[in-house]
């Protein structure tokens, strides 16, 4: 169904990480439009993008504001030029989107080594809370405001003359780790959320290593 | 020394809704801390009701979550637990906790080592 | 959830006896997130282990903790009159949250 000159949205596909949420879309639009909607399951459509000749659309504002719902988003093509036109049901073409609860599905994005300092045979290792686009109380939450310890850190860590590798873990953004007097150690970290099916792991930070900037020594 | 108090009506009736507060003193709720409310059925073992950080992030016990609620008031320094369409079988005594983060093994995870007195709630017509 | 069921239920001994409680879970526990607590009548539970082994501030030293995956043992090495109680394990790693029905020890 639909116009002779509109053809439908397909390939619609959710692109968030850290609760900053895009969605994205085929095809590159040639003489059409579109416009996104959004909807929690119970709740009422809104529109976004109006009358956009991009394939894509942040509705990061609108998942922000309650990232535990579940989210159902559509894309509706009308003629470039003619955005009054309809399609043959009397509305114009749309494509659903697949559900999407951004709590259970937003990539988690790579962590940072904030810090790490050294006293005597332990190491404080320090992971930057990074800040989110989740608002409460007119305040930005981070990253362990919203997930509280369904977030968990993996710290990997090696001597730098070596290749094998320890972990130790943490419900915190902090670790502390015992080492060897006299080596340096290099070390990077992983966000995890265990109890996730999908996405629960993020890419590993950049490395960072004793006797660079970061670090600090103190006997 | 951080001090919790639980506070709120020992009766309530068949269907209505529990509430209790928990204050905190000694300390700030929003200092890193997460913190949960645990109930005993009388004779009984303990049950995790569920649990909040500061930031209002909760978890819930999924045999409760349906009729759970657990809000922070920082201002306050308070918590508290809502639980709603009691029955006799709700009667018990209800405990807030603190959860604090313990150093283990690298890293830290939190356990429950500062909690309130309790305060019995009898669900009773 | 995770099942944690302990055993005995009751264990009759006297002061200066040693006591091991048993706590046994339907499914592996990191050791990470395995805690004791002790209860007195009329009291509200006290942290004793955390971490299955690590003894809680203040907790005396006759008072040890092991195990792992699924298996994991309070051990008092000489029961003093104060340590008669109830005892309950608890996991923290997985909701919900649980406790083992808990290990009643009483003065024989």
């Known amino acids: 169904s639909g116009t002779t000159n509109t053809v439908a949205a397909y390939n619609l596909t959710w692109k968030s990480t850290n609760f900053k949420t895009i969605l994205e879309w085929e095809p590159k639009p040639v003489n059409q439009v579109y416009t996104v909607q959004i909807s929690t399951k119970s709740g009422d459509w809104k529109s976004k993008c109006f009358y956009t000749t991009d394939t894509e659309c942040d509705l990061t504002d609108e998942i922000v504001k309650d990232v535990n719902q579940t989210y159902l988003a559509r894309v509706f093509s009308y003629p470039a030029g003619n955005v009054e036109s309809t399609g043959s049901a009397g509305e114009p073409l749309y494509e659903n989107s697949p559900e999407f609860t951004p709590y259970l599905e937003t990539n988690l994005g790579q962590p940072t080594i904030q810090s790490f300092e050294q006293v005597g045979t332990k190491v404080n290792v320090t992971v930057e809370d990074e800040r989110t686009l989740v608002r409460r109380n007119n305040t930005f939450l981070s990253l362990r405001d919203v997930f509280g310890k369904d977030l968990i850190y993996t710290l990997y860590y090696w001597k730098s003359s070596s290749s094998g590798k320890k972990t130790a873990k943490t419900n915190t953004n902090e670790f502390l780790i015992d080492v060897d007097k006299g080596e340096n150690y290099c070390f990077s970290v992983q966000a995890v959320i265990p109890s996730r099916t999908v996405n629960r792991k993020s890419t590993d930070s950049p490395v960072e290593c004793m006797g660079q900037e970061k670090g600090e020594f103190r006997e | 020394q951080v001090q919790l108090q639980e506070s709120g009506p020992g009766l309530v009736k068949p269907s209505q809704t529990l509430s209790l507060t928990c204050t905190v003193s000694?300390?700030?709720?929003?200092?890193?801390?997460?913190w949960s409310w645990i109930r005993q059925h009388p004779g009984k073992g303990l049950e995790w009701i569920g649990e909040?950080?500061?930031?209002?992030?909760?978890r819930y016990n999924p045999s409760l979550k349906s009729r759970v609620t657990i809000s922070v008031d920082t201002s306050k320094n308070q918590f508290s637990l809502k639980l709603s369409s009691v029955t006799a079988a709700d009667t018990a005594v209800y405990y807030c906790?603190?959860?604090?983060?313990?150093?283990?093994?690298?890293?830290?995870?939190?356990?429950?080592?500062?909690w309130g007195k309790g305060t019995t709630v009898t669900v009773s017509s | 959830e995770i099942v944690l069921t302990q055993s005995p239920g009751t264990l009759s001994l006297s002061p200066g006896e040693r006591a091991t409680l048993s706590c046994r879970a339907s499914?592996?526990?990191?050791?990470?997130?395995l805690a004791w607590y002790q209860q007195k009548p009329g009291q509200a539970p006290r942290l004793l282990i955390y971490?299955?082994?690590s003894r809680a501030t203040g907790i005396p030293d006759r008072f040890s903790g092991s195990g792992s995956g699924t298996d994991f043992t309070l051990t008092i090495s000489r029961l003093e009159p104060e340590d008669f109680a109830v005892y309950y394990c608890q996991q923290v790693g997985v909701v919900p949250y649980t406790f083992g029905g808990g290990t009643k020890v009483e003065i024989k």
């Open positions: 499914q592996s526990v990191s050791s990470s997130y």
């Open positions: 909040i950080y500061y930031s209002g992030s909760t």
């Open positions: 971490g299955a082994s």
């Open positions: 906790a603190r959860d604090t983060p313990y150093y283990y093994d690298g890293g830290y995870y939190y356990y429950m080592d500062v």
């Open positions: 000694g300390g700030s709720i929003s200092s890193g801390q997460y």
